[in-house]
Interface confidence: medium
């Protein structure tokens, strides 16, 4: 097949300073090159030949896989969430063997009220979801369950769900101790032993945008970044316009290589640029110098 | 004592919105969830939107999913019901009610005397 | 979806104890509420919790729950409980359902 090559009349000279100028072909005409043989040999960087086009793997892209993109998408999850393993004791519910089994209508029952229970216990946390019952053991009952917390992914999830976690801790410890049996009986929906009171375990999710970003700039991580907009992570180059860490290449186009963000200076009818950001201008002298 | 007083009923055509306020008081307003619940003319009652103390959660019956934006002013002591794309079958009282607890899981101690909204041509 | 049956009427003596009964799926694994409805009035709680009466509730009002059905049950009933009754049940899995309502008529 053949393959028809743009031309392009403007010449880009790197801030190194070495011309990467383009031929200087009649624009009216045509340039076509052969492709011949091995179609995959034109697709670089791990690219495959579809039969169409170069399919590129992430952060190529191009006709031949050649460039490297200024942007590679991250996702992280709607939510995050975080578990913790709790034990309590209640006093106000005798313990049968019923209870073991959790298709019986006294587990039932009992599961119920204690759900409840929480429900009320952690009003007021935003990102209580529910409890969920692991385990009924002799004690009067000693009741082995996780409370699970969800919140909308965000930067600070973490300091949000630590925060959720601490909250927790402190209702539970906080009706554990008022909610006791006085003289044999339970004025509220459930009584408790204040001694109890047990945190085993807390299992937050793990999600960091940075690690996706190094993981999927490949070897160029070092000079991707990450960075917040409307508190979604971007994973950047320098070369991709609009945030902090954006080159600036005023006269010039940003070009990714495995040195880094580098400005490809543009020479117009003029003047040429240079400069590591393409913001020194010389004028081009109005006289032919024949050689 | 607790009141609950309902506001922004009437009369509007297929496809226009509403606006439904509930002014509450008489309690904490920050410390319960709050319900729109609704009734047809002569039908049953049909929950339709709730809302936690600090609005960190919202759910949504299915029917009004989409269309409907419960919200809330905790500096006005107030509940919203914004009705968008109406139908006629969203015809009804609309009554807002207290849930006990911050979180909306719970049962509804007090109502409000209702708003009708009439959804015609 | 979760669905909450009540017979549309019940019909009682006065004095005598009217029973009135919510079916759902399991709903026994959930928390009833039942609610009070007077011609043109909003609704009332009366009993929350399967069993518990809020504070002004007469004692003449109890309730229970267990397997499929809930059960309101007024005894003594007076031609003042004549109304609507509505059972509602919530839990994460069905959000707030309500029953459709029992008329409770109370005969002269």
């Known amino acids: 097949p053949l393959a028809t090559i743009p031309v392009s009349t403007t010449s880009l000279t790197s801030s190194e300073g070495s011309t990467i100028s383009t031929p200087s072909v009649d624009i009216s005409t045509p340039v076509t090159t052969s492709i011949v043989g091995d179609q995959c040999s034109r697709c670089k960087n791990g690219g495959f030949w579809d039969g169409l086009k170069c399919q590129c793997l992430t952060p190529y892209y191009g006709e031949s896989c050649e460039e490297v993109v200024n942007s590679i998408d991250i996702a992280p999850p709607e939510t995050v969430s975080a578990q913790m393993e709790l034990t309590v004791t209640v006093t106000s519910v005798k313990f049968t063997d019923e209870l073991k089994n959790h298709s019986s209508q006294e587990f039932r029952e009992f599961n119920k009220t204690f759900t409840e229970q929480m429900n009320i216990v952690y009003s007021g946390i935003p990102e209580y979801v529910g409890v969920n019952i692991t385990n009924l053991r002799l004690g009067s009952v000693v009741v082995e369950h996780d409370v699970l917390l969800r919140t909308k992914y965000t930067p600070e999830y973490k300091t949000a769900l630590d925060n959720a976690t601490e909250v927790v801790k402190q209702k539970i410890t906080k009706v554990t101790t008022e909610q006791i049996m006085t003289n044999d009986n339970c004025s509220a929906l459930m009584c408790f032993n204040t001694t109890g009171t047990q945190v085993q375990n807390i299992t937050v999710t793990q999600y960091d945008p940075v690690e996706e970003c190094r993981q999927k700039a490949e070897e160029y991580e070092d000079y991707f970044l990450v960075e917040y907009r409307d508190q979604k992570p971007y994973c950047i180059s320098p070369c991709e316009s609009g945030f902090n860490a954006s080159k600036n290449c005023n006269h010039g186009k940003c070009q990714m290589s495995q040195n880094g963000a580098r400005c490809l200076c543009v020479t117009t009818e003029t003047h040429w640029y240079s400069g590591e950001d393409c913001n020194q201008g010389t004028q081009k002298s109005h006289h032919h110098h024949h050689h | 004592q607790v009141q609950l007083v309902e506001s922004g009923g009437g009369v509007v055509q297929p496809g226009r919105s509403l606006r439904l306020s509930c002014a509450a008081s008489g309690f904490t307003f920050s410390n319960h969830g709050m319900h729109w619940v609704r009734q047809a003319p002569g039908k049953c009652l049909e929950w339709v939107a709730g809302i936690w103390s600090d609005a960190s959660n919202k759910y949504y019956a299915e029917a009004v999913k989409g269309r409907f934006t419960i919200s809330r002013d905790t500096s006005k002591n107030t509940l919203y019901l914004q009705m968008n794309s109406l139908r006629a079958e969203d015809t009804a009282v609309y009554y807002c009610?207290?849930?006990?607890?911050?979180?909306?899981?719970?049962?509804?101690?007090?109502w409000g005397q209702g708003t009708l909204v009439t959804v015609s041509s | 979806s979760y669905e909450l049956t009540q017979s549309p009427s019940v019909s009682v003596s006065p004095g005598q104890t009217a029973s009135i009964t919510c079916s759902g799926d399991k709903l026994g694994d959930k928390y009833t509420s039942w609610y009070q409805q007077k011609p043109g009035q909003s609704p009332v709680l009366v009993i929350y919790h399967d069993r518990k009466r809020p504070s002004g509730i007469p004692e003449r009002f109890s309730g229970s729950n267990s397997g499929n059905t809930a059960t309101l049950t007024i005894s003594g009933t007076q031609a003042m409980d004549e109304a609507d009754y509505y059972c509602q049940a919530y839990d994460r899995s069905t959000a707030w359902v309500f029953g459709c309502g029992t008329k409770l008529t109370v005969l002269r």
């Open positions: 009610a207290r849930a006990t607890y911050t979180t909306g899981w719970s049962y509804f101690d007090y």
